[in-house]
């Protein structure tokens, strides 16, 4: 089948890194500078991706493969193949229409990207706050208040689950 196809279409013999040049009797010509073909039998070469501005070159373009970009320090990749670069913020901040802004009280972000998220509501799980939250860190929930009452021991069976919205008396 391959031989039949090559007799019918001389372009199928052109390897990656070349293109089938219709202007030269379908001779396989090398891809021009700053272009590539990653598969054989192509009639044109694709233009290499250029990494500009906040994009920097992670892998140079070759005659058979496209360039790959990542983001300059201070930015991180978004999208397939790093199609976008988004500015980092500090922990405890999020990127808004006015740039990096501190998380509002009651929210936190422990990464340089993403949005501020609300602190965990310990009472929903019948627990108490062991360590207060900050802009950079979520609260740490501890044992339920009932577990902390005097005389309670580790062998005490767990308290029955409370309905949501009801706090311990």
């Amino acid at each position: 089948f391959e031989r039949t196809r090559s007799l019918q279409d001389p372009c199928s013999n052109c390897p990656a890194g070349t293109f089938c040049d219709n202007n030269r009797n379908q001779i396989c010509s090398p891809c021009p500078p700053n272009s590539f073909s990653s598969a054989g039998g192509q009639r044109t070469c694709d233009i290499c991706r250029q990494c500009k501005g906040v994009f920097r070159t992670r892998k140079e373009c070759s005659s058979t493969s496209n360039a790959e970009c990542d983001c300059t320090p201070g930015f991180h990749c978004l999208g397939a193949g790093c199609s976008m670069c988004e500015q980092d913020c500090k922990q405890g901040q999020e990127l808004t229409k006015k740039g990096c802004k501190d998380c509002c009280f009651g929210t936190f972000n422990d990464q340089k990207r993403g949005i501020c998220r609300p602190w965990t509501n310990c009472s929903l799980d019948g627990k108490s706050v062991l360590v207060n939250g900050t802009k950079e860190r979520d609260v740490v929930c501890g044992p339920s208040p009932a577990d902390l009452s005097p005389g309670a021991s580790s062998v005490t069976p767990p308290a029955p689950a409370r309905e949501p919205g009801h706090s311990p008396q």
Partner: nanobody
Framework: EVQLVESGGGLVQPGGSLRLSCAVS????????MSWARQAPGKEFEWVSS???????YYVESVKGRFTISRDNAKNTVYLQMSSLRPEDTAVYYC????????????????WGQGTQVTVSS
């Protein structure tokens, strides 16, 4: 061919002013959002300011009230008026298209200028 050419950089004393220009050709400027970014020596790239095609503007907190971004669609030019300059404003300033319309986010298809050096020193 798309071109963005910045000019207007230079050496200025603290408290002084400069006006950067970015002349654009090769695409429809009037419908394009534009932005300025900067990179100080040994520091990371930083988004500075952006302007929608409508003229709506955004600024990073550190330059708000001191820098003004504007555009002249008749001249295919975007400007950055910088006043009350500080030594920490020293950087190479870059003009770029802004296709994402998201502050601090650039797309791989955005175009960038070569940059103009701004030095604030006494």
């Amino acid at each position: 061919e798309v071109q963005l050419v910045e000019s207007g950089g230079g050496l200025v004393q603290p408290g002084g002013s400069l006006r950067l220009s970015c002349a654009v050709s090769g695409f429809t400027f009037s419908s394009s959002a534009m932005s300025w970014a900067r990179q100080a020596p040994g520091k990371e790239f930083e988004w500075v300011s952006s302007i929608y095609s409508s003229g709506k503007t955004y600024y990073v907190e550190s330059v708000k009230g001191r820098f003004t971004i504007s555009r002249d669609n008749a001249k295919n030019t975007v400007y950055l008026q910088m006043s009350s300059l500080r030594p920490e404003d020293t950087a190479v300033y870059y003009c770029a298209t802004w296709k994402t319309l998201r502050v601090g986010v650039w797309d791989e298809s955005d175009y960038w200028g070569q940059g103009t050096q701004v030095t604030v020193s006494s």
